[in-house]
Amino acid sequence: SERCDDWGLDTMRQIQVFEDEPARIKCPLFEHFLKFNYSTAHSAGLTLIWYWTRQDRDLEEPINFRLPENRISKEKDVLWFRPTLLNDTGNYTCMLRNTTYCSKVAFPLEVVQKDSCFNSPMKLPVHKLYIEYGIQRITCPNVDGYFPSSVKPTITWYMGCYKIQNFNNVIPEGMNLSFLIAFISNNGNYTCVVTYPENGRTFHLTRTLTVKVVGSPKNAVPPVIHSPNDHVVYEKEPGEELLIPCTVYFSFLMDSRNEVWWTIDGKKPDDIPIDVTINESISHSRTEDETRTQILSIKKVTSEDLKRSYVCHARSAKGEVAKAATVKQKVPAPRYTVELACGFGATGGGSGKPIPNPLLGLDSTHHHHHH
């Protein structure tokens, strides 16, 4: 049949490989789009066909599987490059078909160059290690399937440009790199170079990942609301702008969703008929502890608004907390001339000194928030 289920260009699978290294690329059809695997498809008489479009070209062309030393080959649902070349960059399509069925998907392949310190346009996976937590390991990624278990490759580990040797707390152990205890100074890019023989040739795989040292679960605490707090009173006159920051500290927790929100009289701000805006900013410490600030703003506050309950809430995997802001309507200070006149009247024209107004001792703004 002429019709073919075309899944389009699968940009989620932006495959990047290093130049002059082997690459094995599985047809994404069986991983993401179809409910059966290659073996089932093959048994059912379906054929897997590969073709490609070169970078900056529109013309689809077959892949040349007759290159010297079988540089490009297909094995089951895997397209092999032994090794890649820079001009292999392009969009690759795998199509599964027989006379009655057809399904295809394309994906981009980018062959990238690395410099002498392994820097490249490659998007690096990030591996998080807990600070001062005990022995933790990273493993050289994406090397499965390149050589049989009978082949024992050699591995060299680098941190940045430098071979890892005689580091106090980092020990290469074959495919693994062990951190006896992780410190902030261990942040950086780590590269494993894997060398293995195959059919009378030697191949190399280079894999780089970023290590980020983060807060340990041993030190994790529930969210801490720094503001609002009991020391700050938000005292406003009607018509003034009311700004209340909610600043919350979250310990780093792997895969935890940190949330901050305001309620006004127990409801979400959107459900209250007042013109309220909330702006959020987020900052992180070196160990990825997070500080979130949500500033609740009412441009022209009314006396009704000043009677409402404003509560900041925070939640993480460690728990949920809430804190109410103390909001008051400012009591207008008596005007100076009136006060003076009352003073004279009361004393029968005494010393001429104004009577102290106890209200003037209060800070009427009480804005201790940070933008």
Partner: antibody, heavy 119, light 107 residues
């Protein structure tokens, strides 16, 4: 297959400079280090330095800093070594050799270039 | 710089004999050691890398071993084409340094 073709023998006067080449073929020139090694007549091997043609990064042994300069031309897949201020002790065979990161730093060798310094 | 001490400096052996050459580094080189064979008038040929890994195409009668500072190259049964000068090289750190060589001749 991988080959390193070194330029022919050089005869030079003391104090002069000489530049010789190592042309690579059969692999991606910019992905491997190029090592350079000196061997005086009847003597052992001596590592001079290395260059990564991908970005031009070089490393030298202290003795050859200022004496040897390593360069690479990506367009022609050719590595060069220039020796300056030539003296009789620079008379030797100079080899280039391909190497990768970490594990296999020397795999394929060139045939060598003979440099003779004589007045 | 790391100093590589190779021994013996020369040796005689019979064809079919088992031959062992050693190399000692002035400090731990973490198995970053290669062995080379140079025949008269030829460029060196790489035999072994990372102390015990045979380069493709090198006969299996060659084997390497060792760790820390001490390394060895063994030829299980000497053949005529194995004659020449053997060099070790440390590449644990820059500058790379070669051993002084072992000349292997027929007894």
């Amino acid at each position: 297959q991988v080959q390193l073709q070194q330029s022919g023998a050089e005869l030079a006067r003391p104090g002069a400079s000489v530049k010789f080449s190592c042309k690579a073929s059969g692999y991606t020139f910019t992905s491997y280090w190029m090592q350079w090694v000196k061997q005086r007549p009847g003597q052992g091997l001596e590592w001079i330095g290395t260059i990564y043609p991908g970005d031009g990064n070089t490393r030298y042994t202290q003795k050859f800093k200022g004496k040897a300069t390593l360069t690479a031309d990506k367009s022609s897949s050719t590595a060069y070594m220039q020796l300056s201020g030539l003296a009789s002790e620079d008379s030797a065979v100079y080899y280039c050799a391909r190497g990768y990161f970490g594990n296999l730093v020397f795999d394929v060798w060139g045939a060598g270039t003979t440099v003779t310094v004589s007045s | 710089d790391i100093k590589m001490t190779q021994s013996p400096s020369s040796m005689y052996a019979s064809l079919g004999e088992r031959v062992t050459i050693t190399c000692k580094a002035s400090q731990d080189i973490n198995t970053y050691l290669s062995w080379f064979l140079q025949k008269p008038g030829k460029s060196p040929k790489t035999l072994i890398y990372r102390a015990d890994r045979l380069v493709d195409g090198v006969p299996s009668r060659f084997s390497g071993g060792g760790s820390g500072q001490d390394y060895s190259l063994t030829i299980s049964s000497l053949e005529y084409e194995d004659l020449g000068i053997y060099y070790c090289l440390q590449y644990d750190e820059f500058p790379y340094t070669f051993g002084s060589g072992t000349k292997l001749e027929i007894k």
